[in-house]
């Protein structure tokens, strides 16, 4: 990881946001086709 | 990074290099700024790979990040400067290592 | 918006003595843990101390220790030295979707005498 200079830390939070992102962006358009669908 | 002086509503470009390690696609490059005597404040992350940005709520809109993972390369683009954007700014890799600073005077 | 209150904001103590420096987070740390701790002197950029609340950054010596967890968090600075003398900061990490990813706490001088 960047020549073993920094810490896994902040890549591991990171991931965390990007996952949690994907998330709400396929939870939100799931519940905008169940709103149109009915 | 050549920081310097600038007249209120200009804009400068802020470049800071990674020297003796190579980014990696998972590295951040972030952004913080210090006003003279005053603490730290945040501005925003790049992500070295996929150029993913977050910036501070009160950015506002008025600076620009951005990278060139080749040539392991950060800049911040600031716009429309006020007196209150005098400060000294830093980068850091994943808010771990950081840059000597660049200091932004905002003067007419 | 998140706030992190840092208190006090000026200490002063003897070489040898304790400090103890405490970071307040509203709303509360992502993951309750991830905050970290800077050292910084006048004229120089932020050092890196502490990660993850109480884990020790590369070369920091073990006279630095960290804890806490949610909103409350402490910097412990066990058997002061002159050289410590400089100010602290805590950096929190936050949930980005709903607030800034990031703050810092407003600071903690530290004085040796």
């Known amino acids: 990881h960047s020549d073993g200079i920094f810490t896994d830390s902040y890549s591991r939070y990171r991931k965390q946001m990007a996952v949690k992102k994907y998330l709400a962006a396929v939870l939100g358009k799931r519940y905008k086709q169940r709103v149109k669908n009915k | 990074a050549e920081g310097g002086l600038v007249k209120p509503g200009g804009s400068l470009k802020l470049s800071c290099k990674a020297s003796?390690?190579?980014?990696?696609?998972?590295?951040?490059i972030c952004w913080v700024r210090q006003a003279p005597g005053k603490g730290l404040e945040w501005i925003g992350c790049i992500s070295a790979g996929g150029g993913s940005t977050d910036y501070a709520n009160w950015v506002n809109g008025r600076f620009t990040l951005s990278r060139d993972i080749d040539q392991s390369t950060g800049c911040l683009q600031l716009n429309s400067l006020t007196d209150a954007d005098t400060a000294m700014y830093y980068c850091?890799?994943?808010?771990?290592?950081w840059g000597q600073g660049t200091l932004v005077t905002v003067s007419s | 918006a998140q706030v992190l209150t840092q208190t006090p904001s000026s200490v002063s103590a003897a070489v040898g003595g304790t400090v103890t420096i405490n970071c307040q987070s509203s709303p509360s740390i992502y993951s309750g843990a991830f905050l970290s701790w800077f050292q910084q002197k006048p004229g120089q950029p932020p050092k890196f101390l502490i990660y993850?609340?109480?884990k020790l950054a590369s070369g920091v010596p073990s006279r630095f220790s960290g804890s806490g967890s949610g909103t409350q968090f402490t910097l412990t600075i066990s058997d002061v030295q002159c050289d410590d003398a400089a100010t602290y900061y805590c950096?929190?990490?936050?949930?980005?979707?709903?607030?800034?990813?990031?703050?810092f706490g407003g600071g903690t001088e530290v004085v040796v005498k």
């Open positions: 993850e609340a109480s």
């Open positions: 003796g390690f190579t980014i990696s696609r998972d590295y951040w």
């Open positions: 950096l929190g990490f936050y949930d980005c979707s709903s607030v800034d990813c990031h703050a």
């Open positions: 850091a890799g994943n808010l771990e290592i």
